[in-house]
Amino acid sequence: SSPTSSASSFSSSAPFLASAVSAQPPLPDQCPALCECSEAARTVKCVNRNLTEVPTDLPAYVRNLFLTGNQLAVLPAGAFARRPPLAELAALNLSGSRLDEVRAGAFEHLPSLRQLDLSHNPLADLSPFAFSGSNASVSAPSPLVELILNHIVPPEDERQNRSFEGMVVAALLAGRALQGLRRLELASNHFLYLPRDVLAQLPSLRHLDLSNNSLVSLTYVSFRNLTHLESLHLEDNALKVLHNGTLAELQGLPHIRVFLDNNPWVCDCHMADMVTWLKETEVVQGKDRLTCAYPEKMRNRVLLELNSADLDCDPILPPSLQTS
């Protein structure tokens, strides 16, 4: 059936907190005002409507909910809690809705939620318990399989006096709730580093997107536990070289494809191991496109075409011979 739109102001209140319950039970197939609903597709779209809250009268059949392009600002605890619960909701897209605050337990009472997209929201305040729902050391497992967090970094002047990377990682690791996560996208977040413990605690990952960040090094990151990892996107970062430990770990992952385009590779003596590895490995996609950025004399040289004689380091002069 084609999407239907309802402008009904039927008063069904099934709000985000236990203290506010339905005034009267919502009709099972009712479509909220300003939304489009297709019961056949189990889909509700409330898109670009400047909503400041999640609609209260969502139909019980909803499996795919699009709330993109709104002005939600804050997701409180139980923002999607309803009586009866939205038991079928599997995919929730909140991208581009001006969210800057996601509180503990915001996605509680969504037992089937497998895909969550919070991309393009300036998340200055992401609770450590946003996805786990509780501050217990071990929480009930989250049903989430895909978590899309691309471009959630707030503008510099809105960031709190803490590490943005740390805030995001705390939410990913809290209560070990995301052990079943298979896809994690963290592109375009100005990440300078990847905290060393994050990947070890997400053992089910198949797809990890860290593209378009500012990662300089993977020295302290371990991929060893990610035995199911199929794709690793590291394009458009600030990587200078991959060292032996990282190369060996990547080579040891049975299903992996790695994407390394558009990094400022430094083609000096420290690059020799990586060049040797690139020539032998099948895991790097588009490896023939990787080029040197530094030093100047090596700029735009293709990594695969380099040999050990090309990769030299300027000798470090002893202090007594250095000039100011």
């Epitope: 402008a7 009904s8 102001s9 008063s11 069904s12 209140s13 709000p15 985000f16 907190l17 203290s19 506010a20 005034a23 909220p32 005002a33 300003l34 939304c35 409330c46 409507r49 400047n50 909503l51 400041t52 809250e53 999640v54 609609p55 209260t56 009268d57 002005q71 600002a73 804050v74 409180p76 605890a77 800057d100 605050e101 509180r103 200055a124 305040d125 709190q160």
Partner: antibody, heavy 120, light 111 residues
Framework: EVQLVESGGGLVQPGGSLRLSCAAS????????MHWVRQAPGKGLEWVSY????????YYADTVKGRFTISRDNAKNSLYLQMNSLRDEDTAVYYC?????????????WGQGTTVTVSS | DIVLTQTPLSLSVTPGQPASISCRAS??????????LHWYLQKPGQPPQLLIK???NLESGVPDRFSGSGSGTDFTLKISRVEAEDVGVYYC?????????FGQGTKLEIK
């Protein structure tokens, strides 16, 4: 000038019904969420209900849940509160108030109020 | 529900003197993004009017002798020099969650 004018109050017996109205002018009504807030005689302020700008969200205080229904007609710049099964403790001045959002908002404009008296 | 407790419940102030009202919340009503606490004045026989939004932001048209401060659970409304027109009942209100609640009110009188 922002104006909110409540009407529909009066004397009603316990168990009876009333419908309050709030007429808005001086601003784009459809861009704002609206609240009802009440004040019992000699008492403080009590939030009653909220409706979002496009009637997608409705919230109620526990004390009125299941008895009161909030609604709005953006074409008529009007807010309503249908009050059923009225009780003595519902006696109060009822104010309508404007907000830009529920949690990130505040009551930035108020009507003069309409008095509801529930008594046998 | 979040309980807001105001102190004192009444105060009598000489014109030109300062006044201070406290509002304490039963749980934090601040995040790092926003403070969900607002102040109102209800003058005798009138509806309430917004004075301070988000703890410290003066509403347009409100005299700058009014100021607000605080975060978390403890908030303060200050009047630097009380004037006769400031009499009435002052309320704090949170918007952290449903239900929205008000403090019980503080009655300001002029000596």
């Amino acid at each position: 000038e922002v104006q909110l004018v409540e009407s529909g109050g009066g004397l009603v017996q316990p168990g009876g019904s009333l419908r309050l109205s709030c007429a808005a002018s001086g601003f784009t009504f459809s861009n704002f969420g609206m609240h009802w807030v009440r004040q019992a005689p000699g008492k403080g302020l009590e939030w009653v209900s909220y409706i979002s700008s496009g009637s997608t969200s409705f919230y109620y205080a526990d004390t009125v849940k299941g008895r009161f229904t909030i609604s709005r007609d953006n074409a008529k710049n009007s807010l309503y509160l249908q009050m059923n099964s009225l009780r003595d403790e519902d006696t109060a001045v009822y104010y309508c108030s404007r907000t830009n959002s529920l949690l990130r908002g505040f009551f930035d404009a108020w009507g003069q109020g309409t008095t509801v008296t529930v008594s046998s | 529900d979040i309980v807001l407790t105001q102190t004192p419940l009444s105060l009598s102030v000489t014109p030109g003197q300062p006044a201070s009202i406290s509002c304490r919340a039963s749980q934090s009503v601040s995040s790092s993004s926003y403070t969900y606490l607002h102040w109102y004045l209800q003058k005798p026989g009138q509806p309430p009017q917004l004075l301070i939004k988000s703890a410290s932001n003066l509403e347009s048209g409100v005299p700058d002798r009014f100021s607000g401060s605080g975060s978390g659970t403890d908030f303060t409304l200050k009047i630097s020099r009380v004037e006769a027109e400031d009499v009435g009942v002052y309320y704090c209100q949170h918007s952290w969650e449903i239900p929205l609640t008000f403090g019980q009110g503080t009655k300001l009188e002029i000596k």
